[in-house]
């Protein structure tokens, strides 16, 4: 139940990431740690790296408010789950600083990709026989 609630939150975050991608030119062009090809059981660790990253509005134009609201939503901590807690204590997961740093556009794309991976794993775990490759 808690895990399900978590995944619903991930789905909502995808929409927020997609919205932020429309304002990528209004974000500070800073390079941020962007996990990619995250190893199994380190997804929550990587997720927290994305949340900790200092994504910032460039404070230009009319989009500043909507960007800041979206960033705030991205950073909102999800309710704790056993899976999340277990992974947090895995010393084998890479530290945030060890991930390749990318500009906001690629950072958001990789964040979305991780969210999708987590939802797809969750969906597949409840289903037998439709995963083909």
């Amino acid at each position: 139940q808690g895990q399900d609630r978590h995944m619903i939150r991930m789905r909502q975050l995808i929409d927020i990431v997609d919205q932020l991608k429309n304002y990528v030119n209004d974000l500070v062009p800073e390079f941020l740690p962007a996990p990619e090809d995250v190893e199994t059981n380190c997804e929550w660790s990587a997720f927290s790296c994305f949340q900790k990253a200092q994504l910032k509005s460039a404070n230009t134009g009319n989009n500043e408010r909507i960007i800041n609201v979206s960033i705030k939503k991205l950073k909102r901590k999800p309710p704790s789950t056993n899976a999340g807690r277990r992974q947090k204590h895995r010393l084998t997961c890479p530290s945030c600083d060890s991930y390749e740093k990318k500009p906001p556009k690629e950072f958001l794309e990789r964040f979305k990709s991780l969210l999708q991976k987590m939802i797809h794993q969750h969906l597949s775990s409840r289903t037998h026989g439709s995963e083909d490759s």
């Epitope: 139940q1 399900d4 619903i8 789905r11 909502q12 995808i14 929409d15 997609d18 794309e109 979305k112 990709s113 999708q116 939802i119 797809h120 969906l123 597949s124 409840r126 289903t127 439709s130 995963e131 083909d132 490759s133």
Partner: antibody
């Protein structure tokens, strides 16, 4: 704004293979999930399956042994092949994008495929 | 497979009316439900995802509620462009399945 356009023959003979292509514009196919849904005349929508940008697939078990979905990132296209078709496969076929993994946020307008000799 | 049952299959309403469509899943799907609007010859449009989240760009007169097995799509004040067929879809497990549709017609 992402746009999708289905293309392929409107008429296929029984026992042959139905082949459709979906061209994606206004966005890259190198992320997200890309699916096919169909609607037989006077009936409801049926999910056929989808493919991720990395090539992993999920198919509807009812069609699984006859379906292949593939992606061509260089052309920003993905394709559906449905083998051994019968009249029951006559339908409007839609291609769609799934950013949220299990719901479809952008769809094509659909293309009618009739299976008849 | 999870069966999705929509009711009513059609509804006649006037501009300004409040319209409610229900969708029932054959087993619990938490909040993994989407709603679509479909007009003949047009691309279907995602309105609501995870039962109650409004898709970007969709007017706020559309709202969704429910969890478990029973879900509702509400159009608070029907507009001329809202006459269409509406479908629910479970996003809880493969295979993804749709309801039979509800046609909203002009009274």
């Amino acid at each position: 704004q992402v746009q999708l356009q289905e293309s392929g023959p409107g008429l296929v003979k029984p026992s042959e293979t139905l082949s459709l292509t979906c061209t994606v514009s206004g966005g890259s196919i190198s992320s997200d999930f890309w699916g096919w849904i169909r609607q037989p005349p006077g009936k409801g929508l049926e999910w056929i399956g989808y493919i991720s940008s990395r090539g992993s697939t999920n198919y509807n078990p009812s069609l699984k042994r006859r379906v292949t979905i593939s992606v061509d990132t260089s052309r920003n296209q993905f394709s559906l092949k449905l083998s051994s078709v019968t009249a029951a496969d006559t339908a409007v076929y839609y291609c769609a994008r799934s950013a949220g993994v299990a719901d479809f946020d952008f769809w094509g307008q659909g293309t009618l495929v009739t299976v008849s000799s | 497979d999870i069966q999705m049952t929509q009711s009513p299959s059609s509804v006649s309403a006037s501009v300004g009316d409040r319209v409610t469509i229900t969708c029932r899943a054959s087993q619990g799907i938490s909040s993994w439900l989407a709603w679509y609007q479909h007009k003949p010859g047009k691309a279907p449009k995602l309105l609501i995802y995870v039962a109650s989240s409004l898709q970007s760009g969709v007017p706020s007169r559309f709202s969704g509620s429910g969890s478990g097995t029973d879900f509702t799509l509400t159009i608070s004040s029907l507009q001329p462009e809202d006459f269409a067929t509406y479908y629910c879809q479970q996003a809880n497990s493969f295979p993804l399945t749709f309801g039979g549709g509800t046609k909203v017609e002009i009274k």
